[in-house]
Interface confidence: low
């Protein structure tokens, strides 16, 4: 009689995570008498998956009824597959012995590959806010996928980005893989409403990629521009000076008025107006009683935005003993102040 052969017809089996894997094995003879065992891996460190003779293997079921005397089908099913189950499985025939059964013959092995979906991409931006024209880095991470082949793309507002670096780890064989990508994004003043999107495509996703997003509103800081102007005289001895704070983001802003260097009033931006690009505008005004001042009045609008050092604009009101015609209203210059003859 021909010697028993253990046949594993499938060199490889591909299964999606969560599904059931069927590992096929048949023997060509009933002799010698003895049990079948399944192992993952070969050699001394192999892991027992199923023992026909004894043990409890809750995830494993047999395809055939192994209690029937003439059964030669030793195929098994392993339920709820995870990437950790990947590996080469061997169907091994043992010969009954005393005191222990003796390994008789092994099948050639079946490689189980697990298709595991990548986790939802997580996009994270820089720890500190940055201002327009700066290059900031965003990272995208996704884990637990298999096989290793994966495609990652970056978009900003639907436009694909090209400046990024991607690594898939580990480099060698593994039960599952992780992807890590870093994209460089140059901020613009219009980016308050912008989004950065990381898109991951994988064979397990059947053409429906996963996306992770980050809002640039959490990354960008747009510093304000200040403009101090003098409004027409409301009363004979009163002047209304306004400070226009424009195009800033985020909203956190505190404004302080100083008269000749002394704090006159401090207020926090509350009822701001929002621009189409997501930045904010705000206006504060100061009513100055000119008759209370003997000398020229230096008015300063000082703004602290989002915890940054204060920026300021100044404006000089010239208190004159000789009445002159009221000057025209123009914005304060960057470098200094506009003089006004107030009477």
């Amino acid at each position: 009689e021909e010697e028993l052969q253990v046949i594993q017809p499938d060199k490889s089996v591909l299964v999606a995570a969560g599904e059931t894997a069927t590992l096929r094995c048949t023997a060509t003879s009933l002799i010698p008498v003895g049990p079948i065992q399944w192992f993952r891996g070969a050699g001394p460190g192999r892991e027992l998956i199923y023992n026909q003779k004894e043990g409890h293997f809750p995830r494993v079921t047999t395809v055939s009824d192994l209690t029937k005397r003439n059964n030669m089908d030793f195929s098994i099913r392993i339920g709820n597959i995870t990437p950790a189950d990947a590996g080469t499985y061997y169907c091994v025939k043992f010969r009954k012995g005393s005191p222990d059964d003796v390994e008789f013959k092994s099948g050639a092995g079946t490689e189980l590959s697990v298709r595991a979906k990548p986790s939802a991409p997580v996009v994270s931006g820089p720890a500190a806010r940055a201002t327009p024209q700066h290059t900031v880095s965003f990272t995208c991470e996704s884990h637990g996928f298999s096989p290793r082949d994966i495609t990652l793309k970056w978009f900003k507002n639907g436009n694909e980005l090209s400046d990024f670096q991607t690594n898939v780890d580990p480099v060698g064989e593994s039960v599952s893989y992780s992807i890590h990508s870093t994209a460089k994004v140059v901020l613009t003043r219009e980016d308050v409403h912008s989004q950065v999107i990381c898109e991951v495509a994988h064979v397990t996703l059947q053409g429906d990629p996963l996306r992770g997003t980050a809002n640039l509103s959490e990354t960008i800081r747009v510093p304000p521009t200040l403009e101090v102007t003098q409004q027409p005289v409301r009363a004979e001895n009163q002047v209304n000076v306004t400070c226009q704070v424009r195009k800033f983001y985020p909203q956190r802003l505190q404004l302080t008025w100083l008269e000749n260097g002394n704090v006159s009033r401090t207020e926090t931006a509350s009822t701001v107006t929002e621009n189409k690009d997501g930045t904010y505008n705000w206006m504060s005004w100061l009513l100055v009683n000119v008759s209370a001042h003997r000398d020229d009045v230096k008015l300063t609008c000082q703004v602290e935005h989002d915890g940054q050092p204060a920026v300021s604009k100044s404006h000089d009101l010239k208190v004159s003993a000789h009445p002159k015609e009221q000057g025209s209203n123009t914005a304060a210059e960057n470098t200094g102040s506009n003089e006004r003859n107030i009477y």
Epitope: A128, T131, K184, V311
Partner: antibody, heavy 127, light 105 residues
């Protein structure tokens, strides 16, 4: 004392790539911004790149798109990778330590807050 | 752009002011280079902060968009090129001025 030691300079070929490394000591490296400044022969100082807390980076106009700055806080090193080298990249490259770890004035200004410099490493791009 | 004068001169003992105009919101740094290619020395950073090893003769200030490096009691050893650094007011990118050569007569 703060020391910054640059390496990686030398003769480079046009179109090639350059990798400069700055090894820092004498301070808590991870707590400070770091940068690179260069000086072409007979010219003034030119900002090349800076890397800030949170790993946001800034690049000078002349190297934008060709340069990558990175840091290894464990090794206390900052690296400048410059691709597609040109003759005008010739010069002395200085490693610079920033006085702070964040940004001020609403902008991260890598040229307004340098408090320590390396001795420089010379790069010559020539065929 | 960041603009500074190409050259200034002074007699020993005099006070020299070197100006640098750029960003009104930014901070400024001042760096001394005694010979081309030698490592610069930081005199002032963040507009008015002086490293502990720099003499108090050097001070920094700012008014509006103009920063000033003041050297009181100029010495012959102060002959050098002085660079200011800040950010460009329109692009927000970090830049240096072209440098100011100080000649001590």
């Amino acid at each position: 004392a703060v020391t910054l030691d640059e390496s990686g300079g030398g003769l480079q070929t046009p179109g090639g790539a350059l990798s400069l490394v700055c090894k820092a000591s004498g301070f808590t490296f991870s707590s400070f911004n770091m940068g690179w400044v260069r000086q072409a022969p007979g010219k003034g100082l030119e900002f090349v790149a800076a890397i800030y807390s949170g790993n946001s980076a800034e690049y000078g106009a002349a190297v934008q798109g060709r340069a990558t700055i990175s840091r290894d806080n464990g090794q206390s090193t900052v690296r400048l990778q410059l691709n597609n080298l040109r003759a005008e990249d010739t010069g002395i490259y200085f490693c610079a330590k920033d006085a702070g770890s964040g940004c001020y004035s609403g902008v991260c200004a890598g040229t307004s807050s340098i408090d320590a410099w390396g001795h420089g490493t010379e790069v010559i791009v020539s065929s | 752009a960041v603009t500074q004068p190409a050259s200034v001169s002074a007699n020993p003992g005099e006070t020299v002011k070197i100006t640098c105009s750029g960003s009104s919101s930014g901070s400024y740094g001042w760096y001394q280079q005694k010979s081309p290619g030698s490592a610069p020395v930081t005199l002032i950073y963040e507009t008015n902060k002086r490293p502990s090893n720099i003499p108090s003769r050097f001070s920094g200030s700012k008014s509006g968009s103009t920063a000033t490096l003041t050297i009181t009691g100029v010495q012959a050893d102060d002959e050098a090129v002085y660079y200011c650094g800040s950010e460009d007011s329109s692009t927000y990118l970090s830049i240096f001025g072209a440098g100011t050569t100080l000649t001590v007569l």
